[in-house]
């Protein structure tokens, strides 16, 4: 806590101006107005103060606003945010995209820190939904963001929002995220033609069920093995050999390097050993021919 | 109203050395950094040194560096340049300035030429 | 050689919009305040934009700073022949320890 000293004479700050760098703490304590920092904010991020004065002006505008900042201060805030904990986010009422965008300008470059995750968080239960041009800026900040929701939370995103969406965007969803997401996505990008559709939609199959898949074979869309690696397991079980190599197209020679990997390993254990010959890969462990295919999913079910 | 007006400036043989004053008034100078910026004729401008309202840290140019020294006396309102083993190429208007990262007020200048 | 990159020169008639750059590094306009200084002949510099966009009182508000990154610009709406002047971008610099100009851009009003 610094203390109440009385502010030197000629020191009284008339504006936030460079003068103030070469203030002591107290002095800034006592010679800055709190009333007239938080109508002159914009200033202090052009300032280069050091982080002991940031404290400083910081302790200053939490005493002048003890239930949280307005948004007209929140807006201006710059390197001063960085001070800030999520104890003090979280009683701001921030609903300006322009205030969000300028706060998470300052934390750029780096991880998502708490007190961004805190801010985002305020900011799109104060919204109720994750809409596009939410979505459009948090994701240009932060591409891995949309993954770090969980199922629940991205059940609020809007179909139309899907849009806004990137491939990389998605990198590090797992399959529970993206269960959520393609369905949102089919259903926004189901007016497109074929090859657009498939182009928009490749980055979610991860969450598409066998059925979708099947359609997809007949579409001659050429999937690539990175994206066949990514689909459930259970989605690519089924899918016979003349389907798989309708869906991949000429990728269908990858599946030999993939051989050891799910979900090609499993798929392999699945399907008839003459149908994966007729690929003429030498893929090896498919069923043996006479023997025959009992589907134990579906004896236990009737048991 | 601010004023800054500077002196000392004038025709010099290289080698030699110059003292220029800046005179202050029109606001609370020891509350205020400081700066002395330049122009060689025809040319841009160039910052050659600055000092905080407590000459704690002085900054300078590398050009200048170990030949200038800057100064202030907070009692006269006055800001100070001596420059010694001057060179042909430090002739200039030698500005003063007030503060040091954002120049909002210009003395008019004072010539120094250095020549033999 | 400026460490603030501007160009040499810029023109236009009265009443048309001219934009200077002014292009740093993260070390000067990158992690700091641009200034623009407008320098008519046979004058001293005067400020006329501190920290990126602000205007000084009496400085006209067709004159306009900003700044993105590591570069910054200077644009002036409704050009005037009394525009006519040599302006310049500055930035302190820590890795310095000082302050840097841009070379200066002298603006033409044909």
């Known amino acids: 806590e610094v203390e109440k000293t009385a502010c030197p004479s000629g020191k009284k700050a008339r504006e936030i101006d460079e003068s103030l760098i070469f203030y002591k703490k107290w002095e800034l304590e006592a010679c800055v107005d709190a009333a007239l920092l938080a109508t002159q904010m914009d200033r202090v991020n052009a300032i280069p103060f050091t982080y002991e004065q940031l404290d400083v002006l910081k302790h200053k505008l939490d005493e002048l606003y003890p239930q949280g900042y307005p948004e007209s201060v929140i807006q201006h805030l710059g390197y001063l945010f960085l001070k800030m904990s999520p104890e003090d986010i979280r009683k701001w009422n921030v609903t300006s995209l322009e205030t969000l965008k300028a706060l998470l300008e300052v934390n750029k470059g780096h991880e998502m820190s708490p007190q961004v995750a805190t801010l985002i968080d305020r900011f799109v239960k104060g919204r109720g939904q994750l809409d596009k041009d939410t979505l459009d800026t948090l994701t240009a900040f932060y591409p891995g963001y949309l993954c770090s929701l969980s199922p629940e939370e991205l059940s609020s995103v809007p179909p139309s929002s899907i849009w806004a969406v990137r491939p990389q965007d998605l990198d590090t969803c797992d399959p529970r995220q993206l269960d959520v997401l393609y369905p949102k996505a089919r259903l926004a990008f189901q007016n497109m033609n074929g090859s657009e559709y498939f182009v928009k939609i490749q980055s979610f199959l991860g969450g598409a069920p066998t059925e979708d898949l099947k359609a997809l074979s007949q579409q001659n869309v050429s999937m690539d093995l990175a994206t066949f690696m990514k689909l459930r397991t259970d989605a690519v079980l089924p899918l016979t050999v003349a389907e798989v190599q309708k869906l991949l197209g000429p990728h269908v020679e990858g599946l030999k390097a993939e051989e050891r990997h799910r979900p090609v390993r499993d798929w392999i254990l699945r399907q008839r050993q003459d149908d994966l010959d007729t690929l003429g890969l030498g893929l090896q462990g498919g069923i043996p021919n006479g023997y025959l295919v009992l589907d134990l999913s579906m004896q236990e079910a009737l048991s | 109203e601010v004023q800054l007006l500077e002196s000392g400036g004038g025709l010099v043989q290289p080698g030699g050395s110059l003292r220029l004053s800046c005179a202050a008034s029109?606001?609370?100078?020891?509350?205020?950094?400081m700066s002395w910026v330049r122009q060689a004729p025809g040319k841009g401008l160039e910052w050659v040194s600055g000092?905080?309202?407590?000459?704690?840290?002085?900054y300078y140019a590398d050009s200048v560096r170990g030949r200038f020294t800057v100064s202030r006396d907070n009692s006269k309102n006055t800001l100070y340049l001596q420059m010694n083993s001057l060179r042909a190429e430090d002739t200039a208007v030698y500005y003063c300035?007030?503060?040091?990262?954002?120049?909002?007020?210009w003395g008019q200048g004072t010539l120094v030429t250095v020549s033999s | 050689q400026s460490v603030l990159t501007q160009p040499p020169s810029a023109s236009g008639t009265p009443g048309q919009r001219v934009t200077i750059s002014c292009t740093g590094s993260?070390?000067?306009?990158?992690?700091?305040?641009v200034s623009w200084y407008q320098q008519l002949p046979g004058t001293a510099p005067k400020l006329l934009i501190y920290?990126?966009?602000k205007r000084p009182s009496g400085v006209p508000d067709r004159f306009s700073g900003s700044k993105s990154g590591t570069s910054a610009s200077l644009a002036i709406s409704g050009l005037r022949s009394e525009d006519e002047a040599d302006y310049y971008c500055?930035?302190?610099?820590?890795?310095?320890?000082?302050?840097?100009f841009g070379g200066g851009t002298k603006v033409t009003v044909l």
């Open positions: 300035a007030k503060n040091m990262f954002s120049f909002d007020y």
């Open positions: 029109g606001f609370t100078f020891s509350n205020y950094a």
């Open positions: 000092i905080p309202p407590d000459s704690g840290s002085k």
């Open positions: 920290y990126n966009s």
């Open positions: 500055g930035s302190w610099d820590p890795s310095l320890n000082g302050y840097v």
């Open positions: 993260s070390s000067n306009i990158g992690s700091n305040a």
